[in-house]
Amino acid sequence: SEVEYRAEVGQNAYLPCFYTPAAPGNLVPVCWGKGACPVFECGNVVLRTDERDVNYWTSRYWLNGDFRKGDVSLTIENVTLADSGIYCCRIQIPGIMNDEKFNLKLVIKPAKVTPAPTRQRDFTAAFPRMLTTRGHGPAETQTLGSLPDINLTQISTLANELRDSRLANDLRDSGATIRIG
């Protein structure tokens, strides 16, 4: 089953995905695709990184986090109902069938109608790109810092445990990662 994340129409959606690069200067390629992870690669690729850069992206999809330190979480800007569905984060570890695949389910809800503007709404209007749907605040405050690591043998267990978005959010906040190498 997929881990579920929610966002409202018009907001930025945030889909977490992490790994720990094995060595400086030699990042692991990552692809994001719309649709569940296939056997190889990503279907309907929306963003891709290589050993150093974001080398392919489509409109509204970007990496707001510290991707060169392994935070390859996807931000989808100004979401609509059509953005609902499964997204694949694939960490393309060298070697045969070594890739780590994560399916994340994005559920888009209609925007709440509020009767009058509030201070919070004013802040959101002023900084739309700097907010995530889970209220982490400005992007520059989101760092990988000193995060605990999860090794590859724990991944399947982890995937089984991530049944609800509340637990997934807790995991994101505690900063669990995959260590490569």
Partner: antibody, heavy 120, light 107 residues
């Protein structure tokens, strides 16, 4: 301390090629990317490409594909850039710059620059 | 490729002034922006990396901020030795691109 020592100024004729060097010292050469940047007189900076000395992997700005070739000699910790089919438009100062993982591939050290003049 | 629009082109200053320059990316680059200082006849020097991190040895009067598409570089109290050209650069995706530069000059 980290140093990037570039070769001296070059005066070449249109149509010729030139190969300039960038000798690195004070750090592990294979751990960092080496990028090359062009600065035309009184103008901004243009990224040409990079090479990763560890495996020789390269990436080029589309604009400089076919114009520039990046290579390294690991044994001497030296990066090279060869420019082909030179025209007056290639007259500029060329910098090598170290792209550091710890500075997110911004350039923490730069060479002093090699001035290239293309003139008949 | 991503265009970095840097303003202003020239910035007249007096010693002690607080000055701010901006860089706007044509699309989001996360926090992957650096700021460099270049004095006449010299190579550029890294001042700020990853939008807001001051590089080793850079005085704390230099600060950077921003995320996404809008970035700001500030010198809190300009010193004579700060007279130079300042460039922003995005290193999110190749080809990495630089702003056109902001030249600090005496009023």
């Amino acid at each position: 301390q980290v140093q990037l020592q570039q070769s001296g100024p070059e005066l070449v004729k249109p149509g010729d090629s030139v190969k300039m060097s960038c000798k690195a010292s004070g750090y592990t050469f294979t751990d960092y990317y080496m990028d090359w940047v062009k600065q035309s007189h009184g103008k901004s900076l243009e990224w040409i490409g990079y090479i990763y000395p560890n495996n020789g992997g390269t990436s080029y700005n589309q604009k400089f594909k076919g114009k520039a070739t990046l290579t390294v000699d690991k044994s001497s910790s030296t990066a090279y850039m060869e420019l082909h089919s030179l025209t007056s438009e290639d007259s500029a100062v060329y910098y090598c710059a170290r792209g550091g993982y710890y500075s997110y591939y911004s350039y923490d050290y730069w060479g002093q620059g090699t001035t290239l003049t293309v003139s008949s | 490729s991503i265009v970095m629009t840097q303003t202003p082109k020239f910035l007249p200053v007096s010693a002690g002034d607080r000055v701010t320059m901006t860089c706007k990316a044509s699309q989001s680059v996360g926090n992957n922006v650096a700021w460099y200082q270049q004095k006449p006849g010299q190579s550029p020097k890294l001042l700020i990396y990853y939008a807001s991190n001051r590089y080793t040895g850079v005085p704390d009067r230099f600060t950077g901020s921003g995320s996404g598409t809008d970035f700001t570089f500030t010198i809190s109290s300009v010193q004579v030795e700060d007279l130079a050209v300042y460039f922003c650069q995005q290193h999110y995706s190749s080809p990495y691109t630089f702003g056109t530069g902001t030249k600090l000059e005496i009023k």
